[in-house]
């Protein structure tokens, strides 16, 4: 957890992905209870979910969320307009595409409406919190007698994503994996025609448009080899 207390002089360490600050209180009370941490993820830059663990509250509390963008034209405080709920208690907020500004510092504030002094603010770099959709339309081309090429599509700008390809045969106990850059193409130079291969791919918003750590879900697997169609030996796009 990268955290720091924000100081009035503005000299916070802006290299951290987010910062946490709590309002000071004069006496020990409910106000001193820390608020849960807010976690935000931007899904394919289509919407963003900011969620917190509502069960960490000592009693069921409908915490409220406000947000704004620091030092920008979008610095007006906004109320959450679409809450997410867990057992009828607020546990998150969903923001739509037009409310997402990847390259401005996103400030999110959680507050206990019954104790307005009890609030916590975090600053997030949204370009580091993007999770793309899983790769789609995996296809295999046989380039030569022993060489396969795997291609896939992403529903996002190609150069913003890097990829991880995993493959194995039915004889393997574990996956072999290979990193692939924005060109979203993978070649396997030596294929054993007697074995059945399985391939899958996942993608990450890194490093050209952001520095996200989280990968997408895995694609549907695609298979090639002894048990696949013999109709067209040069093109296979069979999903499990």
């Amino acid at each position: 957890l990268n955290t720091t207390i924000l100081t009035p002089n503005g000299n916070e360490d802006t290299t951290a992905d987010f910062f946490l600050t709590t309002m000071p209180t004069d006496s020990l009370s409910v106000s001193t209870l820390p608020l849960p941490e807010v976690q935000c993820f931007v899904f394919n830059v289509e919407y963003m979910n900011c969620t917190w663990n509502s069960s960490s509250e000592p009693q069921p509390t409908n915490l409220t969320l406000h947000y704004w963008y620091k030092n920008s034209d979008n610095d007006k405080v906004q109320k959450c307009s679409h809450y997410l709920f867990s057992e009828e208690i607020t546990s998150g907020c969903q923001l739509q595409k037009k409310e997402i500004h990847l390259y401005q510092t996103f400030v999110v504030q959680l507050q206990d409406p019954r104790e307005p002094r009890r609030q916590a603010t975090q600053m997030l770099k949204l370009q580091n919190l993007v999770i793309p959709w899983a790769p789609e339309n995996l296809t295999l081309h046989k380039l030569s007698e022993s060489q396969l090429e795997l291609n896939w599509n992403n529903r996002f700008l190609n150069h913003c994503l890097e990829h991880l390809v995993q493959y194995r045969t039915d004889w393997d106990h574990s996956w072999t994996e290979q990193s692939v850059d924005y060109r979203h193409k993978f070649s396997l130079p030596s294929v054993d025609g007697q074995k059945r291969y399985t391939f899958r791919v996942r993608s990450r918003f890194n490093p050209l448009c952001g520095s996200a750590q989280h990968w997408s879900e895995w694609s549907h697997p695609i298979h090639w080899g002894s048990n696949t169609s013999k109709e067209n030996p040069f093109l296979f796009a069979l999903e499990a």
């Epitope: 990847l102 370009q127 700008l157 448009c209």
Partner: nanobody, 125 residues
Framework: QVQLQESGGGSVQAGGSLRLSCTAS????????MGWYRQAPGNECELVST???????YYADSVKGRFTISQDNAKNTVYLQMNSLKPEDTAVYYC???????????????????WGQGTQVTVSS
């Protein structure tokens, strides 16, 4: 499948004009920042002009007053009108797409081969 297809390049005399077009598909065009880069032989990829989703534009100092960037959201197309062309404008021109807000708030150097094949512009004296 994300695709950017440039067209409109060609050979022209110094002082002439060309209009480059770039048609985009496979992503939300009107929610992206678009740009034009160029690369002359032996040179690095150079940012020429950008247009953000809010309509704001940027021009490299070397093309200010001569080049104009525009876009047509209905056609998913971005244009670069190039007037008063000079021999030093000779290069392969590449169309680029970035996440919304990239150019105004983030930046970072780009390689020209991140996008399409480009279109050749040759200006002779």
């Amino acid at each position: 499948q994300v695709q950017l297809q440039e067209s409109g390049g060609g050979s022209v005399q110094a002082g002439g004009s060309l209009r480059l077009s770039c048609t985009a598909s496979g992503f939300t065009f009107d929610d992206s920042d678009m740009g034009w880069y160029r690369q002359a032989p032996g040179n690095e990829c150079e940012l020429v002009s950008t247009i953000s989703s809010d309509g704001s534009t940027y021009y490299a100092d070397s093309v200010k007053g001569r080049f104009t960037i525009s876009q047509d959201n209905a056609k998913n197309t971005v244009y670069l009108q190039m007037n008063s062309l000079k021999p030093e404008d000779t290069a392969v021109y590449y169309c680029a797409a970035e996440p919304r807000g990239y150019y105004s708030n983030y930046g970072g150097r780009r390689e020209c081969n991140y996008w399409g094949q480009g279109t050749q512009v040759t200006v002779s004296s």
